[in-house]
Interface confidence: low
């Protein structure tokens, strides 16, 4: 109704910036040969580029980045037994962003 | 054999725009990330620009921020840099060069780059 | 920016001399260090990355050591054809860097 419209808070925009997301920790990232075992934890937080940008031929990209090493647990199954192992992982957090120019994509054909 | 063959270079004037292209072959183009680096006469390495495999991350020097772009053509194996608004300390020659590992281009240029072309040669100059 | 810091920037040695060129990062970069050797005219060469692993087809007498903000490159045993500009660079952040350049030249 046209009541519920005048109390209505104004739409923000989501602006470019860095925000937290989850990461998952996929388990090519540890072993790419072998997929007989766990990785703990299965997902962890990142900080990404993320957001609106004014028009359709701009989006939010990250304009510097930073890696962050974390270890990680790398659980294998051996005859039905856990063997813990220790494993780093390289994330790739976003320091700072930009609404840049997109480059106009090419139809896949 | 994996090989990185760069065109493109020349001589132009200062103001002036330029196209550098590198030719892949031997190799998934599409698995890896890659550079450009160039390197002024007498001079050391300059890091360019580094794209991510897929296109989607594009970083680059301060020194070229908004003069220069960097893409790619996965189905033509090929990278290219648009160059723009060229200034005399632009000279130098030009390498692109293959992130190593190639297979995870969230955190694609930890590992160096382990392949590089023979590098084309770009002069700025009136 | 990430400044990375080369010594010396050439040195003279005699082929079986062991030779060591050290960088320092203006900050902690953990282990995200690499080296190459360029030859003149020559592309530039992966040697060491990571800090202190060996690139496929590199001849061991290379090594790479150190974390943090220093490291060390080091020839065991100099040959003819290691004579070159050697340069570390670092992989921790945007926008990537490269030292200034070690010369390696005979003596």
């Known amino acids: 109704s046209l009541g519920s419209l005048t109390i209505a808070e104004p739409a923000m925009i989501a602006e470019c910036k860095t925000r937290t997301e989850v990461f998952e920790i996929s388990r090519r990232l540890i072993d790419r040969t072998n997929a007989n075992f766990l990785v703990w934890p299965p997902c962890v937080e990142v900080q990404r580029c993320s957001g609106c940008c004014n028009n359709r031929n701009v989006q939010c990209r990250p304009t510097q980045v930073q890696l962050r090493p974390v270890q990680v647990r790398k659980i294998e199954i051996v005859r039905k037994k856990p063997i813990f192992k220790k494993a780093t992982v390289t994330l790739e957090d976003h320091l700072a962003c930009k609404c840049e120019t997109v480059a106009a994509a090419r139809p896949v054909t | 054999e994996v090989q990185l063959l760069e065109s493109g270079g020349d001589l132009v004037q200062p103001g002036g725009s330029l196209r550098l292209s590198c030719a892949a072959s031997g190799f998934t183009f599409r698995s890896y990330a890659m550079s450009w680096v160039r390197q002024a006469p007498g001079k050391g390495l300059e890091w360019v620009s580094g794209i991510s495999a897929g296109g989607g991350y594009i970083y680059y020097a301060d020194s070229v921020t908004g003069r220069f772009t960097s893409s790619r053509d996965n189905y033509k194996n090929t990278l290219y840099l648009q160059m723009n608004r060229l200034r005399v300390e632009d000279t130098a020659v030009y390498y692109c060069?293959?992130?190593?590992?190639?297979?995870?281009?969230?955190?694609?240029?930890?590992?160096?780059?382990?392949?590089w072309g023979q590098g084309t040669t770009v002069t700025v100059s009136s | 920016d990430i400044q990375m810091t080369q010594s010396p920037s050439s040195l003279s040695a005699s082929v079986g001399d062991r030779v060591t060129i050290t960088c320092r990062a203006s900050?902690?970069?953990?282990?995200?260090l690499n080296w190459y050797q360029q030859k003149p005219g020559k592309a530039p060469k992966l040697l060491i990355y990571?800090?202190?692993s060996l690139q496929s087809g590199v001849p061991s007498r290379f090594s790479g050591s150190g974390s943090g903000t220093d490291f060390t490159l080091t020839i065991s045993s100099l040959q003819p054809e290691d004579f070159a500009t050697y340069y570390c660079q670092q992989s921790y952040s945007t926008p990537l860097t490269f030292g200034g350049g070690t010369k390696v030249e005979i003596k």
């Open positions: 900050q902690s970069i953990s282990s995200y």
């Open positions: 990571a800090a202190s």
């Open positions: 060069a293959r992130f190593y590992p190639g297979y995870n281009s969230d955190t694609y240029y930890y590992d160096g780059m382990d392949v």
